[in-house]
Every structure is written in structure tokens, then in C-alpha cells.
């Protein structure tokens, strides 16, 4: 399955929207910095596109879940958030189209399940952090920056896979 060119453009638009969503300077939130344990190795160890698709799908699904809570709606600009949802939704559709073509997710191998669980654990730590910080503006800014970083890393993986094939 070849992900359409629009998928790459969508990823870039997603990053751009995340950047535009910034409301306060991260420098004013240095005391709130936190390591969420992004499982980077799960995005670097897979050499087959078929193996990465379920992991990328989980990553985008969890970003969608994180930003579609009522706490998130209160933290961000509604117009930007709506555009952000649209981009993520399109990317999920692209990845699911690959699944339907028989690549990846429906029969996830056990080793891929472990990668998916690593991604879930990472997002659970993010949600725990937000709860602990009572969804403060600084906490959301730390999370926004973290998602930009981790999404960018996973996007880079997609690009490197495309260039290999």
C-alpha cells in the first residue's frame, strides 16, 4: 500500500497547526517540563512499512483522543482545533485504507501489539501529567510541544520509509 502524497502534506499541516496553537511561551513553563518516555525505538526499529502502519495509526488515534476531550476544547482555539481534527481524521483514513488493502492492523502480530502498547503507555503518562497539573495552561503547552516533537519523529519515519521503497 502506498500512502498518498496528501498524507505527507497532511502530516506537515498537522505540525503547522500544532505550532499555531501555541498560546504561551514554553520558556515561561520551564518548571513544568516533564519526560513522558516517548518510545522512539518503536518508530525506528520497524523496517517494513506493514509493521509501522499499526503503530502510526495508534499514535495518531491517541493524539486525536487527547485533543478531543472537553479539557482540551477549553485550552485551545476552537477554529484551529477543528482544522487539527480534520487533518488527523484524514490521516487515520489514509492508514485505515492501507489496512483494508491487507497491510498491517487487522491481524496485528504480537510484536506489533507490544509496540502499540508502548505508545498507549506514553499517552497514558501524558494524560496523568495533565490531571496532576489540573490541566493548567503551562501543562497544556508542555504537552503541545511534546506532541509536536513525537509526531515529527514519527512523520520522519514515514518519510524515510517512502524514500526506501
Amino acid at each position: 500500500c502506498d500512502l498518498p502524497q496528501t498524507h505527507s502534506l497532511g502530516s506537515r499541516r498537522t505540525l503547522m497547526l500544532l505550532a499555531q496553537m501555541r498560546r504561551i511561551s514554553l520558556f515561561s513553563c520551564l518548571k513544568d517540563r516533564h519526560d513522558f518516555g516517548f518510545p522512539q525505538e518503536e518508530f525506528g526499529n520497524q523496517f517494513q512499512k506493514a509493521e509501522t502502519i499499526p503503530v502510526l495509526h495508534e499514535m495518531i488515534q491517541q493524539i486525536f483522543n487527547l485533543f478531543s476531550t472537553k479539557d482540551s476544547s477549553a485550552a485551545w482555539d476552537e477554529t484551529l482545533l477543528d482544522k487539527f481534527y480534520t487533518e488527523l481524521y484524514q490521516q487515520l483514513n489514509d492508514l485505515e485504507a492501507c489496512v483494508i488493502q491487507g497491510v498491517g492492523v487487522t491481524e496485528t502480530p504480537l510484536m506489533k501489539e507490544d509496540s502499540i502498547l508502548a505508545v498507549r503507555k506514553y499517552f497514558q503518562r501524558i494524560t496523568l501529567y495533565l490531571k496532576e497539573k489540573k490541566y493548567s495552561p503551562c501543562a497544556w503547552e508542555v504537552v503541545r510541544a511534546e506532541i509536536m516533537r513525537s509526531f515529527s519523529l514519527s512523520t520522519n519515519l514515514q518519510e524515510s520509509l517512502r524514500s526506501k521503497e
Epitope: N65, L110, M111, D114, L117, A118, R120, K121, Q124, R125
Partner: antibody, heavy 122, light 107 residues
């Protein structure tokens, strides 16, 4: 096959230190939380603490914080529970458990070790 | 802490019977309810997760339902293996907590 294999029973005197172990196999060690659960003989279950083996990030039950500590050795896929000074009230069976996380990030304990009996008596 | 209260604390039944155990949480835990069975001298084992999902390998005679502050575990057509202690658990809030247990024995 997922396995959590715990060390054998321990008999200790009050004030002694102890470390019990849980060796895991059959899955990617760093992908799942591990918790310890206490069961006082004839009583119910109490969740104590959980750890992310990837970087040893921990969350404690406040009832146990400061009295026990959890740690991991990634090189041998083993999780530990440690006491620096045991009390008679620590007499219990201790289970290590693996967490599964659903897509909506609900934790549940899908695999349990066989348990380690710790008896503290003078 | 979220308190989990099981009822009854014990019950007697015969092979082939159906039984229902109820668990109440002191505040809403959504569907973050789970059920475990513990046979004498053994570690607990997962039966039902997220209130109503049957764990792989668990017989379909076990069913879970409910959400919010109350959930139930129903066992139909009791088998000799089912005489054990049952625990509910919530993982909605820290610390995670269990019910006090329901001991199911042979009438």
C-alpha cells in the same frame, strides 16, 4: 507465552531488609507497566505501586509510599520490590502483575505472577 | 480513595446454578471496572475487563455489565472450578482499589 516468575518464600525478622523479584518473559519488557499487589493471608487485594520499565517512572499508592520501593533491571527483565526495615504487618503474599492498556487507556491486570510469601516474625 | 463494596460477601450455590455478584464504587469510575477470580492457594486471574469485556480464554458463562458506580458479574451454569473468591477492581483513579471479595462456596 507471557510469564511473570516470582522468587520463593522469605522468612525475616522485624527490622531486616528484603528485596523480592519478578522475572518477566514472553513480551517486550518496556512496553507495559508492572505493578505489585499485596494480599494479607485470608484478606483482600491491595494495589501498592506501578512502574514503567522503560525509564523507571513510578506511581505509588500513598499507603505504601516511603515504606517500600520498586525498581527494575532492564538487562534481565526483572522488577523488584524492596523494604529497608520490615515490620510484622508486612507479612503477606506479594504478586507482580502486568498491565494491559486498552485504546481508551484503561488499565487492567492481564497476567499475574504466582506470588511470593513474605513472613515477618521475631 | 475510591471505595469498592462487593455484595454479598459470601454465597453458597450448587453446580449448574447461576449467581450474580454486585460491586459498588464510592464515586463514578465510568467503565473502569474489572473482575478477577482467585482459586484457593493461587494467584488471581482476570475474567472481565472494562465492565463487560470477556478476557481471552474465559468461558462465556461469565458476563459483566454496568458502569458509573455499579457493576455486576453473573456466572451461569456454575462449574466446580468456579467455587472461588471473586474481586472487583477500579482503575479509574489512583490508588487503584479492589472490593473486599465475594467467596462463592458449594451449598
Amino acid at each position: 507465552e507471557v510469564q511473570l516468575v516470582q522468587a520463593g518464600a522469605e522468612v525475616k525478622a522485624p527490622g531486616e531488609s528484603l528485596r523480592i523479584s519478578c522475572k518477566v518473559s514472553g513480551y517486550t519488557f518496556t512496553s507495559y507497566w508492572i505493578s505489585w499487589v499485596r494480599q494479607i493471608p485470608g484478606k483482600g487485594l491491595e494495589w501498592m505501586v506501578k512502574i514503567d520499565p522503560r525509564d523507571s517512572y513510578t506511581i505509588y499508592n500513598p499507603s505504601f509510599q516511603g515504606h517500600v520501593s520498586i525498581s527494575v533491571d532492564k538487562s534481565i527483565t526483572t522488577v523488584y520490590l524492596q523494604w529497608s526495615s520490615l515490620q510484622a504487618s508486612d507479612t503477606a503474599i506479594y504478586y507482580c502483575v502486568r498491565h494491559y492498556l486498552t485504546q481508551s487507556l484503561v488499565d487492567y491486570f492481564d497476567h499475574w505472577g504466582q506470588g511470593t510469601l513474605v513472613a515477618v516474625s521475631s | 480513595d475510591i471505595q469498592m463494596t462487593q455484595s454479598p460477601s459470601s454465597l453458597s450455590a450448587s453446580v449448574g446454578d447461576s449467581v450474580t455478584i454486585t460491586c459498588r464504587a464510592s464515586q463514578s469510575v465510568s467503565n473502569y471496572f474489572h473482575w478477577y477470580r482467585q482459586k484457593p492457594g493461587k494467584a488471581p486471574e482476570l475474567l472481565i475487563y472494562s465492565a463487560s469485556n470477556l478476557q481471552t480464554g474465559v468461558p462465556s458463562r461469565f458476563t459483566g455489565s454496568g458502569s458509573g458506580t455499579e457493576c455486576t458479574l453473573t456466572i451461569t451454569s456454575l462449574q466446580p472450578d468456579d467455587f472461588a473468591t471473586y474481586y472487583c477492581q477500579q482503575t479509574h483513579g489512583y490508588p487503584f482499589t479492589f472490593g473486599q471479595g465475594t467467596k462463592l462456596d458449594v451449598r
